[in-house]
């Protein structure tokens, strides 16, 4: 069976990494496990990994924004940042604003790798399922 | 044969959903039908769906922009928004501006699903084939 | 073996097209050759091609930014722009700024096609491996 995941925003995320909806709506989870915000790889191979995060706020103060997909494996001491997007000076001071960050690329993943998404400012993330998501599929 | 589509911007249309070039240029259409702006799925399965829209204008007034990929099926009463990007407060008032929105993710699609792209303001879309496009492929 | 590439930013790029790290880090190169900034296709077929470029600067002057993936083949006299992103009026004058451009789509590529990435302003590109990359895989 095709190894695939598409998880959507979960608005009760309170800490990093982001947590995801893995059951309801347009979610997919097949041949990959979801555990505490992470997608857990159980078969080594090539995967296309992607994520989109929708940032928005009532009054722009140009707080620097970052959106990272990173990997953790018990064999390695440190997280590996696979993909990252950063934004600075992106809106007009005081105005209501909205902006997305999209990441997607191919990686060679190993069984037991855990993949997570991190953002710099949780309070500025909107978690609508169509707007903020995290997924992958095995090539 | 691989089920795949890559359609490019078609500039002489004023209707929603967006209409697409399905014949000339860098277009691909194989195992999927194109009908009145929509990609029509004829085989149930997992698909990676993507779209990019290039917005631009002569004089920025920060009109809110949205870019949606949505699905319609006669079995369901309402359109399902699969992916969406929104932008607010994205340029300096009065200046010439340009910005893109990119969406891409995996979905489980069913035979007879129709996929479309919608934008909030058609007048601000540039339809160059390299800039505005809509595609998918079956995993 | 799966034909796949994921190349990351190389900070000693001095000219166009961009040059890429093809050996160290989270790089992948299998069944595709890398030559002077280009990915060289050796088997005709359908490929998903993607690139992200991270632009940033110390003091915003809203220099127009462009990010292109283009194709060159000795059979054709001219480069073919496959995908392109443009940005104008994207930051507040004088401020430190940062912004990404992401492109990704499916193309029918032919053996001996060379794929490259071009940007309008090399001095504004940040080449961190997680931020600026170029890849593809055969469907």
């Amino acid at each position: 069976l095709r190894k695939v995941a598409h998880l959507t925003g979960k608005s009760n995320s309170r800490s990093m990494p982001l947590e995801w909806e893995d059951t309801y709506g347009i979610v997919l989870l097949s041949g990959v496990k979801y555990k505490k915000g992470g997608l857990v790889i159980n078969e080594t191979g090539l995967y296309f990994v992607y994520s989109k995060v929708y940032f928005r706020g009532q009054s722009c103060n140009n707080l620097p924004l970052s959106h990272k997909v990173y990997m953790r494996n018990s064999k390695y001491p440190q997280d590996l940042v696979m993909m990252e997007g950063k934004m600075m000076s992106y809106c007009t001071t005081g105005q209501m604003w909205a902006r997305s960050s999209y990441l997607g690329a191919v990686f060679n993943l190993t069984s037991a790798d855990h993949l997570y998404v991190n953002v710099s400012e949780l309070s500025l993330v909107n978690f609508e399922e169509s707007q903020t998501f995290f997924g992958l599929y095995k090539l | 044969l691989r089920k795949v589509a890559h359609l490019t911007g078609k500039s002489n249309s004023r209707s929603m959903p967006l209409e697409w070039e399905d014949t000339y240029g860098i277009v691909l259409l194989s195992g999927v039908k194109y009908k009145k702006g929509g990609l029509v799925i004829n085989e149930t399965g997992l698909y990676f769906v993507y779209s990019k829209v290039y917005f631009r204008g002569q004089s920025c007034n920060n009109l809110p922009l949205s870019h949606k990929v949505y699905m319609r099926n006669s079995k369901y009463p309402q359109d399902l928004v699969m992916m969406e990007g929104k932008m607010m407060s994205y340029c300096t008032t009065g200046q010439m501006w340009a910005r893109s929105s990119y969406l891409g993710a995996v979905f489980n699609l069913t035979s007879a699903d129709h996929l479309y792209v919608n934008v909030s303001e058609l007048s601000l879309v540039n339809f160059e084939e390299s800039q505005t496009f809509f595609g998918l492929y079956k995993l | 073996l799966r034909k796949v590439a994921h190349l990351t930013g190389k900070s000693n790029s001095r000219s166009m097209p961009l040059e890429w790290e093809d050996t160290y880090g989270i790089v992948l190169l299998s069944g595709v050759k890398y030559k002077k900034g280009g990915l060289v296709i050796n088997e005709t077929g359908l490929y998903f091609v993607y690139s992200k470029v991270y632009f940033r600067g110390q003091s915003c002057n809203n220099l127009p930014l462009s990010h292109k993936v283009y194709m060159r083949n000795s059979k054709y006299p001219q480069d073919l722009v496959m995908m392109e992103g443009k940005m104008m009026s994207y930051c507040t004058t004088g401020q430190m700024w940062a912004r990404s451009s992401y492109l990704g789509a499916v193309f029918n590529l032919t053996s001996a096609d060379h794929l490259y990435v071009n940007v309008s302003e090399l001095s504004l590109v940040n080449f961190e491996e997680s931020q600026t990359f170029f890849g593809l895989y055969k469907l």
């Epitope: - | 500039s11 002489n12 249309s13 004023r14 929603m16 002569q58 007034n61 009109l63 809110p64 949205s66 934008v119 909030s120 303001e121 058609l122 007048s123 601000l124 | -």
Partner: antibody, heavy 119, light 111 residues
Framework: QVQLVQSGAEVKKPGSSVKVSCKAS????????ISWVRQAPGQGLEWMGW????????QYNENFKGRATITTDKSTSTAYMELSSLRSEDTAVYFC????????????WGQGTLVTVSS | EIVMTQSPATLSVSPGERATLSCRAS??????????IHWYQQKPGQPPRLLIY???HLESGIPARFSGSGSGTEFTLTISSLQSEDFAVYYC?????????FGQGTKVEIK
């Protein structure tokens, strides 16, 4: 900058026709609608219809269907509004306005053309 | 068609004071994304000028003392501190469907 320049004032007899022009400049003519809006003396604004120069498609207010015809000439970036079977109550200032397709607000206006219908 | 009703017909305000103009639609002009209501200012002998679009967004070049609010069928244009150049007629317009219709206008005059 965006400009819409209309033709001059007209005096017409009841039963006749009038054709008002609106020359656009400073933007891509084929990417925005042109609407026509009229204003009778001392009265409010009444939308008559729009045309999309890109493909020539148009829509009219039911109140003007059959009497108003909106056309464009892409080569000169000019829109036209012809109103036939004129009556005294058609005396008004006629404005052309650029309209965004989807949002449909009128962001740039012509200076107006006074059409007087009198015997 | 959607009927737009503005109130009051005339508003007498002193310079420096706040002015609040109302516009009611006969049915909802809002979607999940936007409220399709726009406000214009017209002075004698001039074409209308766009002030606010999509209920609350300030058009480029319009002073920040103008603001718009509302959703569904009830909308408000507020001028926080009237300047001499603000005395004019104000129209609301919807673009939710065809035909586009305008309110009958509110005249803001000097008290």
């Amino acid at each position: 900058q965006v400009q819409l320049v209309q033709s001059g004032a007209e005096v017409k007899k009841p039963g006749s026709s009038v054709k008002v022009s609106c020359k656009a400049s400073g933007y891509t003519f084929t990417r925005f609608d042109i609407s026509w809006v009229r204003q009778a003396p001392g009265q409010g604004l009444e939308w008559m219809g729009w045309i999309f120069p890109g493909d020539g498609s148009s829509q009219y207010n039911e109140n003007f269907k059959g009497r108003a015809t909106i056309t464009t000439d892409k080569s000169t970036s000019t829109a036209y509004m012809e109103l036939s079977s004129l009556r005294s109550e058609d005396t008004a200032v006629y404005f052309c306005a650029r309209s965004l397709i989807s949002t449909a607000m009128f962001d740039h206006w012509g200076q107006g053309t006074l059409v007087t219908v009198s015997s | 068609e959607i009927v737009m009703t503005q109130s009051p017909a005339t508003l007498s305000v002193s310079p420096g004071e706040r002015a609040t103009l109302s516009c009611r639609a006969s049915k909802s002009v809002s979607t999940s994304d936007f409220s399709y209501i726009h406000w214009y200012q017209q002075k004698p002998g001039q074409p209308p000028r766009l002030l606010i679009y999509l209920a609350s967004h300030l058009e480029s070049g319009i002073p920040a003392r103008f603001s718009g609010s509302g959703s569904g069928t009830e909308f408000t244009l507020t001028i926080s501190s009237l300047q001499s150049e603000d005395f004019a007629v104000y129209y609301c317009q919807h673009s939710r469907e065809l035909p586009r219709t305008f309110g009958q206008g509110t005249k803001v005059e000097i008290k």
